[in-house]
Amino acid sequence: GQFRVIGPGYPIRALVGDEAELPCRISPGKNATGMEVGWYRSPFSRVVHLYRNGKDQDAEQAPEYRGRTELLKETISEGKVTLRIQNVRFSDEGGYTCFFRDHSYQEEAAMELKVEDPFYWVNPG
């Protein structure tokens, strides 16, 4: 059946060195355990994380994300997942696309990650 993919309509913010969490879900909600789910960097289509055949496909990741991502899938049976990026870098800032693929049907949602410097301080005065 058909569905839409919903992601945050606002930038996700994270500090350098911290974790970033990018949520994504399908609408209407349905079990996505058997689907292919992933994130790629837009506009370059570099794979950030890929879940297929019930497993994370680590070998398909772009090298700069290897070992730094985790797909939170406790709620995947409801069609809800979150990509966690650890040890966030300035180079992680930018556009991401989340997609769900069910057989030949695929939908996606774009989102933005803003990375901020925890030590940047503006003098108020």
């Epitope: 309509g9 913010r13 879900r25 406790e74 809800k80 979150t82």
Partner: antibody, heavy 119, light 107 residues
Framework: QVQLVESGGGLVQPGGSLRLSCAAS????????MNWVRQAPGKGLEWVSA????????YYADSVKGRFTISRDNSKNTLYLQVNSLRAEDTAVYYC????????????WGQGTLVTVSS | EIVMTQSPATLSLSPGERATLSCRAS??????LAWYQQKPGQAPRLLIY???NRATGIPARFSGSGSGTDFTLTISRLEPEDFAVYYC?????????FGQGTRLEIK
């Protein structure tokens, strides 16, 4: 089944403080963002505060910023709202409600706890 | 802050009639729009999410439509238990904001 049970409300004098709690069960608590929503007597719903599943991100309505603090203990499946410097206009039923990642509606709500600010 | 405006404030209808409730956003909220029902002394209950999807357990007589700034909740044939207050809410950007509510009362 999903259950949210608030507690900690009561009668408090202006300027006073309370800590509201929301005990969650029936779902993976840490996977969900949590919210506090309030409703003054005979009035509509007002979103107060939200916290991410990990607790790392918090959000507040302008009307409570600097006075209220939201937190959570994922090991205890409990959400909190510390309310300080209370004013008469904070009198309301306070509900906790869950959402997914800040991109979902509030699909489950608690029954609410009444906070009355009066001298 | 996105302001949500509901109309009418009160709607007086009889059981069996069709109810149409409106919600307008001060700026586009895409499809990040929910409808809730609240009865006296109870917590709100989610009816519709993502503008047009019925929540679990909600009867088919409830339907939602719209996107961007204009949304509608329709109750095709009113049952006695449908008389309550209805709120719309946008969850596309913080602060998440609710409309002021529409009271659906028995005529």
């Amino acid at each position: 089944q999903v259950q949210l049970v608030e507690s900690g409300g009561g009668l408090v004098q202006p300027g006073g403080s309370l800590r509201l709690s929301c005990a969650a069960s029936g779902f993976t608590f840490s996977s969900y963002a949590m919210n506090w929503v309030r409703q003054a007597p005979g009035k509509g719903l007002e979103w107060v505060s939200a916290i991410s599943g990990s607790g790392g991100s918090t959000y507040y309505a302008d009307s409570v910023k600097g006075r209220f603090t939201i937190s959570r203990d994922n090991s205890k499946n409990t959400l909190y709202l510390q309310v300080n410097s209370l004013r008469a206009e904070d009198t309301a039923v306070y509900y906790c409600a869950r959402d997914y990642g800040g991109i979902s509606p509030f699909d489950y709500w608690g029954q609410g706890t009444l906070v009355t600010v009066s001298s | 802050e996105i302001v949500m405006t509901q109309s009418p404030a009160t709607l007086s209808l009889s059981p069996g009639e069709r109810a149409t409730l409106s919600c307008r956003a001060s700026q586009s909220v895409s499809s990040y729009l929910a409808w809730y029902q609240q009865k006296p002394g109870q917590a709100p209950r989610l009816l519709i999410y993502d503008a047009s999807n019925r929540a679990t357990g909600i009867p088919a007589r409830f339907s939602g439509s719209g996107s961007g700034t204009d949304f509608t909740l329709t109750i095709s044939r009113l049952e006695p238990e449908d008389f309550a207050v209805y709120y719309c809410q946008q969850y596309g950007s913080s602060p998440y904001t609710f409309g002021q509510g529409t009271r659906l009362e028995i005529k």
